[in-house]
C-alpha cells in the first residue's frame, strides 16, 4: 500500500513536468530506494541542480525567458566548483549569458534568483566589467585567462546556460 501511494505520487509529479520535459533521467540518491533525483533529458546534473546549454542565439531578456518556459533561470554561479563543472560543456569559441545583470548601469550587479551578489565569489576576466552600457554578463574563454566573465550589451545575441533545481520524486 505504501509503495502504491508512493508510485501514484511520483507519477503525478512526473506529469507536472511532462509539458516541457517529456523525458527525465533519474538517479537513486543515497542508499534509499525511495529517493530519486531527476534532471530533464538531456540536461546535465551537478550537486542539487540541472544545467542546459542553449545554443540558440538570443538577447539576455529572451535567453532568460527561454529558460523560464522550461522551469529554469539563467545560471547563477555560486562556487568555483560549479563554474568548473559548467565549463566542461561549453565551446571555447562561444559566449554564454549568465543570470547576472546590472539593469540600471550603476554597477549594482544582481542575480536573476535574487541570490546576493558577492564580490568575493566572482570570476570576471581581468579588467572586467568595464562599460556602463554593458549591463549583462557572459562567460567566455580567453586564451590568456581561460574561462571568465565579461560584461556585454544585453541586446547582442549569445548562447546561454539555464539552471534549475533537481526534481525529487
Amino acid at each position: 500500500n505504501f509503495m502504491y501511494s508512493k508510485t501514484v505520487k511520483r507519477l503525478s509529479k512526473l506529469r507536472e513536468y511532462q509539458q516541457y520535459h517529456p523525458s527525465l533521467t533519474c538517479v537513486m540518491e543515497g542508499k534509499d530506494i525511495e529517493d530519486w533525483s531527476c534532471c530533464p533529458t538531456p540536461w546535465t546534473s551537478f550537486q542539487s541542480s540541472c544545467y542546459f546549454i542553449s545554443t540558440g542565439m538570443q538577447s539576455w531578456t529572451k535567453s532568460q525567458k527561454n529558460c523560464s518556459v522550461m522551469g529554469a533561470d539563467l545560471v547563477v554561479i555560486n562556487t568555483r566548483e560549479e563554474q568548473d563543472f559548467i565549463i566542461q560543456n561549453l565551446k571555447r569559441n562561444s559566449s554564454y549569458f549568465l543570470g547576472l545583470s546590472d539593469p540600471g548601469g550603476r554597477r549594482h550587479w544582481q542575480w536573476v534568483d535574487q541570490t546576493p551578489y558577492n564580490e568575493n565569489v566572482t570570476f570576471w576576466h581581468s579588467g572586467e566589467p568595464n562599460n556602463l552600457d554593458e549591463r549583462c554578463a557572459i562567460i567566455n574563454f580567453r586564451s590568456s585567462e581561460e574561462w571568465g566573465w565579461n560584461d556585454i550589451h544585453c541586446h547582442v545575441p549569445q548562447k546561454s546556460i539555464c539552471k534549475m533545481k533537481k526534481i525529487y520524486i
Partner: antibody, heavy 118, light 107 residues
C-alpha cells in the same frame, strides 16, 4: 533627432567586395546596437546581422557567415558592413537599423543600392 | 531557424475597409513580433512591437494581436496613406526572419 545616414549606391563586379557605411547621429552611438537588413529588388526583407558599436561584438546570420564583416569607427559614429565574394543575387538595397530599448528596430537608414553585374 | 509565413501576399481594399493580415511562425516566438509598413523606395517603418504595442506616432487604427505562433495586424478603417506593403518580423532568436510581405492595393 536620431538619424542614420548611409553611403551612396555602388556597382560591383561578381567576386568583388562592397563596404557600405551607416553614420549615426542624435544619440549616444555606443549605447545601441545596429543591425543590417537587405532587400532584393521586388523582394522581401532579410536580416544579415548585428554589431554593438561599443566593443565591436557581432552576431551574423549563418547564411552570410564568412562573407559578411561588420565593423565600427567610434570616432566618427559610423558602422560598416562589408560583403565579399559578391554574386548577382546580392543585388539589393542594404539598410542599417538601430535596435531601440524595446529590442525592436526603431530607426532605419535610407538604404544603399548595391548592384552586382558583370 | 524560425520561418515566418505571412498571408495574404496581396489584397485589394477600399478606403474605410477593415483589413486583416496574418503571420504564422514555425515555432513559439512568445509575442516578440514587430509589424512594419514600407512604401516604394523607402525604408520600413515600425508600426507595432511585442505583437500589440503601438510604436510612437502610429495611428490607433492599427492594432495587433496574437500569441504563440499566430499573429494578426488589423487596420480598422483603411486610409489613403495606408496603401503600402506590410511585413512581420520575429525577434525571438537569430536569425530575426521577416514574413514575405503583404501588399495592400487600392480596389
Amino acid at each position: 533627432q536620431v538619424q542614420l545616414v548611409q553611403s551612396g549606391a555602388e556597382v560591383k563586379k561578381p567576386g568583388a567586395s562592397v563596404k557600405v557605411s551607416c553614420k549615426a547621429s542624435g544619440y549616444t552611438f555606443t549605447s545601441y546596437i545596429i543591425h543590417w537588413v537587405r532587400q532584393a529588388p521586388g523582394q522581401g526583407l532579410e536580416w544579415m546581422g548585428t554589431i554593438y558599436p561599443g566593443a565591436g561584438d557581432t552576431s551574423y546570420n549563418q547564411k552570410f557567415k564568412g562573407r559578411v564583416t561588420m565593423t565600427r569607427d567610434t570616432s566618427t559614429s559610423t558602422v560598416y558592413m562589408e560583403l565579399s565574394s559578391l554574386r548577382s543575387e546580392d543585388t539589393a538595397v542594404y539598410y542599417c537599423a538601430r535596435m531601440g530599448d524595446n529590442e525592436y528596430f526603431d530607426y532605419w537608414g535610407q538604404g544603399t543600392l548595391v548592384t552586382v553585374s558583370s | 531557424d524560425i520561418q515566418m509565413t505571412q498571408s495574404p501576399s496581396s489584397l485589394s481594399a477600399s478606403v474605410g475597409d477593415r483589413v486583416t493580415i496574418t503571420c504564422r511562425a514555425s515555432g513559439n516566438i512568445h509575442n516578440y513580433l514587430a509589424w512594419y509598413q514600407q512604401k516604394p523606395g523607402k525604408a520600413p517603418k515600425l508600426l507595432l512591437y511585442d505583437a500589440e504595442t503601438l510604436a510612437d506616432g502610429v495611428p490607433s487604427r492599427f492594432s495587433g494581436s496574437g500569441s504563440g505562433t499566430d499573429y494578426t495586424l488589423t487596420i480598422s478603417s483603411l486610409q489613403p496613406e495606408d496603401f503600402a506593403t506590410y511585413y512581420c518580423q520575429h525577434f525571438w532568436s537569430t536569425p530575426y526572419t521577416f514574413g514575405g510581405g503583404t501588399k495592400v492595393e487600392i480596389k
